[in-house]
């Protein structure tokens, strides 16, 4: 019997300080570049080694970024979202949604969780 895949969704506020090479991650998504079907949200596609986000350790590839410094990222064009990050200043507050994949096995087996990429 195959297990069912469920997702545990959590939100977190992450405060980053822009490093010498910036925040150190890439994004995909936006109203003109949907990354997830029927979702124009902004997602983290890559975290760069030794960048501010990597050194902080909380932001993960696959996370959805809900807001930057309190500004909602809903219904933004991709480039407008990029510009928002680039102009966000030295101290950057991100509201993010983590999506943890939880494998529910047959009855009597414990589920196993691993971050989705």
């Amino acid at each position: 019997m195959n297990g069912r895949v469920d997702y545990l969704v959590t939100e977190e506020e992450i405060n980053l300080t822009r490093g010498p090479s910036g925040l150190g991650f890439n994004i995909v998504g936006g109203t003109d570049q949907q990354y997830v079907s029927n979702d124009s949200g902004i997602y983290v596609s890559r975290i760069k080694e030794n960048g501010a986000a990597a050194l902080d350790g909380r932001l993960q590839e696959g996370d959805k970024i809900l807001s930057v410094n309190g500004q909602d990222l809903k219904n933004l064009l991709h480039q407008d979202a990029v510009d928002l990050f680039r102009n966000a200043g030295y101290a950057v507050s991100l509201r993010v949604q983590h999506r943890l994949q939880v494998q529910n096995g047959p009855i009597g087996h414990r589920g196993e969780g691993d971050p989705s990429g």
Partner: nanobody, 127 residues
Framework: DVQLVESGGRLVQAGDSLKLSCAAS????????MGWFRQAPGKEREFVAG????????NYGDSVKGRFSISRDNARNTMYLQMNSLKPEDTAVYFC?????????????????????WGQGTQVTVS
């Protein structure tokens, strides 16, 4: 992942024009930032031009500004580099490069280390 194949490089005379192409595999080409780099013998790989996923934002290296023009056709999964007023110092192997999404930091798309996918290169020689 995306595979990149450059074409169009050849021997030309100073002052001539040339157009390079970069064909990409994969269905998600329109979500990649794309760039052109070049490498002359004995020199480091140098940023030439870059384009945002949509093609709306374009950046150029100082040495090619006003002479080279980058463009992309997301329907054809292809990027181009129109090179005008070529000079002998433009002689190099030209590489097409890509990375998924957009980097959120100013100047990040000028850096070789930012790009995850590279073509094999095409030789441009200006005599």
């Amino acid at each position: 992942d995306v595979q990149l194949v450059e074409s169009g490089g050849r021997l030309v005379q100073a002052g001539d024009s040339l157009k390079l192409s970069c064909a990409a595999s994969g269905r998600t080409f329109s979500t990649y930032t794309m760039g052109w780099f070049r490498q002359a013998p004995g020199k480091e790989r140098e940023f030439v031009a870059g384009t945002s996923p949509s093609g709306d934002n374009r950046n150029y290296g100082d040495s090619v500004k006003g002479r080279f023009s980058i463009s992309r056709d997301n329907a054809r999964n292809t990027m181009y580099l129109q090179m005008n007023s070529l000079k002998p110092e433009d002689t190099a192997v030209y590489f097409c490069a890509a990375f998924r999404g957009s980097c959120v930091d100013y100047g990040c798309d000028f850096r070789v280390s930012q790009y995850d996918y590279w073509g094999q290169g095409t030789q441009v020689t200006v005599s």
